[in-house]
């Protein structure tokens, strides 16, 4: 062991640049710090074979496999991958260690496998083996967290059955409404599964892993708050756990809380109470109603009553499978060029949806906001006044929903013209869709007022890229107009635009654009 060189194998991850092939070099890229791969002499091997930890990377990731050799004198090397030899250029670092690198750019299935590095130094020969595979992310899942009571303790456990195992955090807020937004200073995050402080105003549990982040809010009725105009509604699927928290504050301890389902008291074992004194010596009581696995007959009005507060209710609806309720009829909008406007979709869904807004094959993040009436809303304002088709797509574990929107921007036509030997064509994408006139310019009509009606053909076509309509008009060439200047004009309620074309022989035409408002 003592006469062998000290070998260090590392993996360097790169933030991807657009490239595609493996290179045996030091390639300029933004890199993370090297990760040790625990290179060690492979047991029972014939010859000196070092092996690095098995490497597993995402598709399209870029990495460098690197070996640092602490051995005196020069080294020569050769990479072998799938029986092909790859060029190898060792260099020396500041500590005079030999450095050999293999860059794999944009990892693909064909680049997975065993990479062998043969090194020859003045003292000895040895081989280093790297095994590189593609991570199977198809097995990854991220499930919405749910609550369980901790055995023998007044505490809630947050559970998310996800792969890879998620980081679970409680997100707590003690103020009302807008100030409980995720990044607000009023929000406190606790990265732990068990929560003992259950008296806060707003309690959520979130789970995050490589697939993203999912959260569940602890459904709460606050008897000190004015009830919502519409009855709060909670949806659950058969088999899911039900948790409702009833909270009340009073000047002293002389009050009690009870839960009823459809006017019948909840059975023992389906509720538990906690109480504490707040800073101003008032008493806070909370009473949890819970069912570890709901059935259809757990549907109904759950009412929390207090001897000192008006009672409040929530409607719990148990469904067999999830749903997304919204109107899917397509909607058309026309707006002015600088008018502020947002698309919006109002929906009721359970479980919570994942959604995207799409325009011209590009997806945009989708935000949803809960409304007081049990509905949610998603708005999209980032259209940058580009006309065309916008698509809202939503899905949850059980349902999918798609809604189409068309956005038209009111504007004066802009005319483009082209001509061939047999015809002249003009195009415009103004809105409302323009009407067309063709005029002939001649000695008799130097101002081009002589209208052409023969041989004109108008049509509207969908420009596929944005889903926006383009109107065109084509004039078939006749002997009567050959050699003359003609003018095509597009007009709508916002103005007129014209283009003048010289009709002579095929080839590039000089176009003169007239803008007439």
């Amino acid at each position: 062991n003592q006469d062998l060189p000290v070998i260090k194998c590392v993996l360097i991850n790169h933030k991807n640049n657009d490239s595609s092939v493996g290179k045996s070099s030091s390639y300029p890229m933004v890199s993370e710090s090297p990760e040790d791969l625990g290179c060690a002499l492979r047991p029972q091997s014939s010859g000196t074979v070092y092996e690095a930890a098995a490497v597993e990377v995402d598709v399209s990731a870029s990495i460098t496999l690197q070996v640092l050799v602490d051995a005196p004198g020069n080294i020569s090397c050769l990479w072998v991958f799938k029986h092909s030899s790859l060029n190898c250029q060792p260099h020396f670092d500041l500590q005079n260690r030999g450095v050999v690198s293999m860059v794999i750019l944009k990892m693909t299935e064909t680049q997975a496998g065993e990479y062998l590095l043969f090194i020859q130094s003045e003292a000895t020969n040895y081989t280093i083996l790297f095994t590189v595979s593609i991570r199977n992310t198809l097995l990854y899942t991220l499930r919405r967290p749910y609550f369980r009571k901790m055995e023998n303790q007044d505490a809630l456990v947050c559970i998310s059955e996800s792969v890879p195992e998620p980081i679970v955090e409680w997100v707590l807020c003690d103020s009302q409404g807008e100030s409980c937004k995720e990044e607000s200073p009023a929000v406190v995050k606790k990265e732990e599964k068990v929560l003992h402080e259950l008296f806060g105003t707003d309690i959520r549990c979130c789970a995050r892993n490589e697939l993203g982040r999912e959260c569940t809010r602890l459904f709460t009725i606050d008897l000190n708050q004015t009830p919502q105009t519409t009855l709060p509604q909670l949806f659950l699927k058969v088999g899911e756990p039900l948790w409702i928290r009833c909270k009340a504050v009073h000047v002293n301890h002389g009050f009690g809380l009870t839960w009823e389902l459809e006017n019948k008291a909840l059975e023992e074992g389906n509720y538990f109470e906690m109480s504490t004194y707040s800073t101003n010596r008032t008493m806070i009581r909370i009473l949890f109603a819970f069912v570890s696995s709901v059935a259809r007959n757990d549907t109904g009005y759950y009412t929390c009553s207090s001897s000192k507060h008006p009672s409040q209710s929530a409607l719990v609806t148990i469904v067999e499978k999830g749903f997304i309720n919204a109107t899917n009829s397509s909607e058309d909008y026309e707006i002015d060029q600088y008018e502020e406007f947002c698309f919006s979709v109002r929906f009721k869904a359970y479980p919570q949806i994942r959604c995207t807004w799409t325009f011209s094959r590009k997806s945009f993040p989708c935000e949803q906001k809960g409304l007081d009436n049990g509905y949610s809303i998603s708005k999209f304002c980032n259209h940058k006044h580009q006309p065309g088709e916008y698509i809202f797509h939503a899905e949850n574990d059980d349902a999918q929903f798609t809604k189409m929107f068309t956005l038209n921007i009111r504007r004066k036509p802009q005319v483009l013209a082209e001509a061939s030997a047999s015809q002249a064509s003009c195009f415009s994408d103004g809105y409302p869709l323009p009407s067309w006139t063709w005029k002939k310019c001649s000695d008799k009509s130097p101002n081009c007022t002589e209208e052409i009606t023969e041989g004109v053909w108008n049509r509207k076509a969908n420009r596929k890229v944005f889903g926006q309509w383009v109107s065109s008009s084509t004039l078939n060439m006749s002997e009567a107009i050959k050699g003359f200047l003609v003018k095509c004009c597009a007009y709508n309620s916002l103005g007129t635009s014209c283009e003048t074309i010289l009709l002579n022989s095929p080839g590039p035409f000089p176009f003169i654009q007239d803008n007439i408002s």
């Epitope: 993996l11 991850n13 990760e35 040790d36 791969l37 625990g38 060690a40 492979r42 047991p43 029972q44 092996e51 690095a52 930890a53 098995a54 490497v55 597993e56 990377v57 990495i63 065993e114 083996l129 790297f130 095994t131 792969v163 890879p164 195992e165």
Partner: antibody, heavy 124, light 112 residues
């Protein structure tokens, strides 16, 4: 340079839950077949393996302590957390975290690097 | 669980002399892939353990060649050809064939 460092309370009361964090550097639990184990050693006694977690999220626990242990990782923070419920004076020990490496050809270098250990005393 | 039994419990050796520690497992540590999942560690006073030998007979990086391991199946031996003062401490064997991983009770080596 591979390093591991254990952190957590030095004193825990009986029945309480112990949470220990192993913060490591020089390697990661994301792209290589690596793992982190927790091992403890009561004063003057032998080593006892508690739990391990691998980069692919595979976990194992000591048979006798399984019901009390939970191991988890935060790849981005380069941390592995061990929680042990219902602590008892017999759990007084130095708790170590150590790295293990898995190789493509099916062998393992177990515990090639260790933390310095953190002494946890369980007493009322 | 696999039980690991180490003998002797302690060993007092003259510097330059050889030393041998035995480790027996309650079941074979030979995996179907041909590897024996047996490891040796040395814990010097006041330090965490350090890996000496992996997969029965492979010296870990930086471990002097006076340390050697041998054996197969259920019987394994760690030998120190010439004990030096820096070799004092407790030696542990460990199996990793299956979880839970288990350690031997340790052998304390001291210098005469």
């Amino acid at each position: 340079q591979v390093t591991l460092k254990e952190s957590g309370p030095a004193l825990v009361k009986p029945t309480q839950t112990l949470t220990l964090t192993c913060t490591f550097s020089g390697f990661s639990l994301s792209n290589a077949r690596m793992g982190v184990s927790w091992i403890r050693q009561p004063p003057g006694k032998a080593l006892e393996w508690l739990a391990h977690i691998f980069s692919n999220d595979e976990k194992s626990y000591s048979t006798s302590l399984k019901s009390r242990l939970t191991i988890s990782k935060d790849t981005s923070k380069r941390q592995v957390v061990l929680t042990m419920t219902n602590m008892d004076p017999v759990d007084t020990a130095t708790y170590y975290c150590a790295r293990m490496v898995g190789y493509g050809s099916g062998w393992y270098a177990y515990f090639d690097y260790w933390g310095q250990g953190t002494l946890v005393t369980v007493s009322s | 669980d696999i039980v690991m039994t180490q003998t002797p419990l302690s060993l007092s050796v003259t510097p330059g002399q050889p030393a041998s520690i035995s480790c027996r497992s309650s079941q074979s540590l030979l995996h179907s892939n041909g590897y024996n999942y047996l490891y040796w560690y040395l814990q010097k006073p006041g330090q965490p353990p350090q890996l000496l030998i992996y997969e029965v007979s492979n010296r870990f990086s930086g471990v002097p060649d006076r340390f050697s391991g041998s054996g197969s199946g259920t019987d394994f031996t760690l030998k120190i050809s010439r004990v030096e003062a820096e070799d004092v401490g407790v030696y542990y064997c460990m199996q990793a064939l299956q979880t839970p991983l288990t350690f031997g009770g340790g052998t304390k080596v001291e210098i005469k």
